[in-house]
């Protein structure tokens, strides 16, 4: 009779994480008598996966009934596969011995490969806000995928970005992999509503890539433009001066009126109007009582936006002919207002 052979018909088996792997093994003879054991890996450091004779292997079930006398099918199923289960599995026949069974013959091995989905990409932007025309970096990370082959792309508002650097780790063989990418994005004044998207394509995703997003509203700071204008005289001794604060983002803004360098009033932007591009407009006015001034008045609108150094715009108010004093000591009436969006 021919000597027993251990047949592992599958050179490789590919299983998705969470599924059950079937590792096939048959013997060509019932002789010699002795148990079968399954190992992952070869040599002295091999890991016991299943022992027909003894032990508790909760994730392993046999395909056929190994207690039957004429059984020659030693295939096993391993449940709830994870990337850590990847490796080469050997079906090994032992010959009954005393005191210990002796290894008789091994199958050629079956390589178990595990397909694991990448985690949802996480996109993070810079810690501090930046202004238009500046270049900022975004990072994208995704973990736990297998096999290693993966494709990552960056988009801004649906347009592909080309300035990025991507690494997949580790470089060598591993049960699972991570991807890390850094993209450079040049900000524009219109980017308040913009999105940066990191997209990852992998065999496990079946043509439906995973996306991670970052809103540039959390990254951009659009500094305001200021315009100070003198309105027509409201009463014979009062002049209305307005400060238009336009196209700023975020909303956090404090405005201070100065008369000849002295603080007249400070207010915080509250009722702002929003432009189509996501930036804000705001207007403040100051009623100046010209009868309280003997000389020309320098009015300054000073704006501190989002904790940045103040910017200001001045207007020289000509006090040419004084009307008769009307007993008012007040140089300015403290009035604030918001404008309607005219854009």
């Amino acid at each position: 009779e021919e000597e027993l052979q251990v047949i592992q018909p599958d050179k490789s088996v590919l299983v998705a994480a969470g599924e059950t792997a079937t590792l096939r093994c048959t013997a060509t003879s019932l002789i010699p008598v002795g148990p079968i054991q399954w190992f992952r890996g070869a040599g002295p450091g091999r890991e016991l996966i299943y022992n027909q004779k003894e032990g508790h292997f909760p994730r392993v079930t046999t395909v056929s009934d190994l207690t039957k006398r004429n059984n020659m099918d030693f295939s096993i199923r391993i449940g709830n596969i994870t990337p850590a289960d990847a490796g080469t599995y050997y079906c090994v026949k032992f010959r009954k011995g005393s005191p210990d069974d002796v290894e008789f013959k091994s199958g050629a091995g079956t390589e178990l490969s595990v397909r694991a989905k990448p985690s949802a990409p996480v996109v993070s932007g810079p810690a501090a806000r930046a202004t238009p025309q500046h270049t900022v970096s975004f990072t994208c990370e995704s973990h736990g995928f297998s096999p290693r082959d993966i494709t990552l792309k960056w988009f801004k508002n649906g347009n592909e970005l080309s300035d990025f650097q991507t690494n997949v780790d580790p470089v060598g063989e591993s049960v699972s992999y991570s991807i890390h990418s850094t993209a450079k994005v040049v900000l524009t004044r219109e980017d308040v509503h913009s999105q940066v998207i990191c997209e990852v394509a992998h065999v496990t995703l079946q043509g439906d890539p995973l996306r991670g997003t970052a809103n540039l509203s959390e990254t951009i700071r659009v500094p305001p433009t200021l315009e100070v204008t003198q309105q027509p005289v409201r009463a014979e001794n009062q002049v209305n001066v307005t400060c238009q604060v336009r196209k700023f983002y975020p909303q956090r803004l404090q405005l201070t009126w100065l008369e000849n360098g002295n603080v007249s009033r400070t207010e915080t932007a509250s009722t702002v109007t929003e432009n189509k591009d996501g930036t804000y407009n705001w207007m403040s006015w100051l009623l100046v009582n010209v009868s309280a001034h003997r000389d020309d008045v320098k009015l300054t609108c000073q704006v501190e936006h989002d904790g940045q150094p103040a910017v200001s715009k001045s207007h020289d108010l000509k006090v040419s002919a004084h009307p008769k004093e009307q007993g008012s000591n007040t140089a300015a009436e403290n009035t604030g207002s918001n404008e309607r969006n005219i854009y």
């Epitope: 082959d149 993966i150 394509a201 065999v203």
Partner: antibody, heavy 121, light 107 residues
Amino acid sequence: EVQMLESGGGLVQPGGSLRLSCAASGFTFSSYAMSWVRQAPGKGLEWVSAISGSGSSTHYADSVKGRFTISRDNSKNTLYLQMNSLRAEDTAVYYCAAYSGSYYYYGMDVWGQGTTVTVSS
Amino acid sequence: EIVMTQSPATLSVSPGERATLSCRASQSVSRNLAWYQQKSGQAPRLLIYGASTRATGIPARFSGSGSGTEFTLTISSLQSEDFAGYYCQQYNNWPYTFGQGTKLEIK
């Protein structure tokens, strides 16, 4: 500069074999899945085969399955197509092309200039 | 395998005019579709992927639309360099397959 240069084309008899090569430069070759696409004289494009960046995964068109083998040597930055049992209908210009990453997705964005294979007795 | 059908086979349009090319898949390919341009004697060039995303360096006059089985490539104002062959390709299912092509010629 990103470049891909095919070679190995020529005249071969039906039933014969040829091995095409595609030498890549200017990019990290192992980070990109690669493909072979062919175009018969006066005809359209036909996708032939693809291989992932690591080389662990390969795919073939039904018309070449069992006859053609795609492989890559990442240490040499070279893609190969071993063509056996060649037929007259395999006559075409063969292009190598690179995908956007090591998994074949998003289309092929870098192409070589092609090498001509003629199968005739 | 998924069969990709392009229409028309030949399209005659005057420079400056709009060109609309169609591509139909025999079963859904989601949005996993690319468009390529090929000029005579040259290698193909990727124009659009993901059905509607322009590849790097492709002019804004090229736009793609559609999902599932019906796709369109539109060239808004034809330039002389746009007269060429155009191919759609699905990358949703193996084997990846091309359409038979549309030849865009000067009217």
